[in-house]
């Protein structure tokens, strides 16, 4: 999906009002310096691509983020403010097996959500030059 035509300010508002708090809740009990940010993005569409990938694509050691509150809010925000996104997700959902994954918080998941926090922060500061 090409995120170029999203309403970035609306997505930013959703992040600031709710998604950011859910990410903090998920990370509660973890030191902010515990994980190094290794994933970066260069502009808002690129950031959303990386955010979608880290949030919804299962990875080794962390297969359970899609059921978290921040993930559901992220998906809904993209569906509302990115034209055509919801249709791509509906089609993808219908091709998926209907299988409920048990929610498990692993250290790998915490690291992944830490990366997500960094991507979201970068998304909110699109005019900053990358280090």
């Amino acid at each position: 999906y090409d995120f170029t035509n999203c309403d970035f300010e609306k997505i930013k508002a959703a992040y600031l009002s709710t998604i950011s708090k859910d990410l903090i809740t998920y990370m509660s009990g973890t030191k902010s310096t515990e994980f190094n940010n290794t994933v970066s993005c260069s502009n808002r569409p690129h950031c959303l691509t990386e955010i979608q990938s880290l949030t919804f694509n299962p990875t080794a050691g962390c297969a359970s983020l899609a059921k978290e509150m921040f993930a559901m809010k992220t998906k809904a925000a993209l569906a509302i403010w990115c034209p055509g996104y919801s249709e791509t997700q509906i089609n993808a959902t219908q091709a998926m097996k209907k299988r409920r994954k048990r929610k498990v918080t692993t250290n790998k998941c915490l690291e992944q959500v830490s990366q997500l926090q960094g991507l979201w922060r970068r998304f909110n500061r699109p005019l900053l030059k990358q280090q």
Epitope: T18, K67, M69, K73, K75, Q94
Partner: nanobody, 114 residues
């Protein structure tokens, strides 16, 4: 197996109101994303409003200030109050619970016409 049943659609004049209901059965309605989608003839299905179990809500620009989404956990039911309806709101409206698991209702037709 989760079942979703929408009701409340119908024919209404421009400027009128309707209240859609979505009754969920066979599930626990406590940790959820609940969305109202709509699909107009020849168009893609679009998410117009969403509510989450913590009470936060999203609205598409086209309906903000006119539509209100809510949920009654005790009745396992979600609602979409639609005011100041416009002809462009004409569509089949679907509710979806936790759409990652493909839980969809059958849809209810809303026609706004004089």
């Amino acid at each position: 197996e989760v079942q979703l049943v929408e009701s409340g659609g119908g024919l209404v004049q421009p400027g009128g109101s309707l209240r859609l209901s979505c009754a969920a059965s066979g599930c626990i309605f406590s940790t959820y994303f609940m969305g109202w989608f709509r699909q107009a003839p020849g168009k893609e299905r679009e998410l117009v409003s969403a509510i989450f179990s913590d009470g936060s809500t999203y609205y598409a620009d086209s309906v903000k200030g006119r539509f209100t989404i809510s949920a009654d956990n005790s009745k396992n039911t979600a609602y979409l109050q639609m005011n100041s309806l416009k002809p462009e709101d004409t569509a089949v409206y679907y509710c979806a619970l936790d759409w990652n698991l493909n839980r969809w209702g059958q849809g209810t037709l809303v026609t706004v016409s004089s």
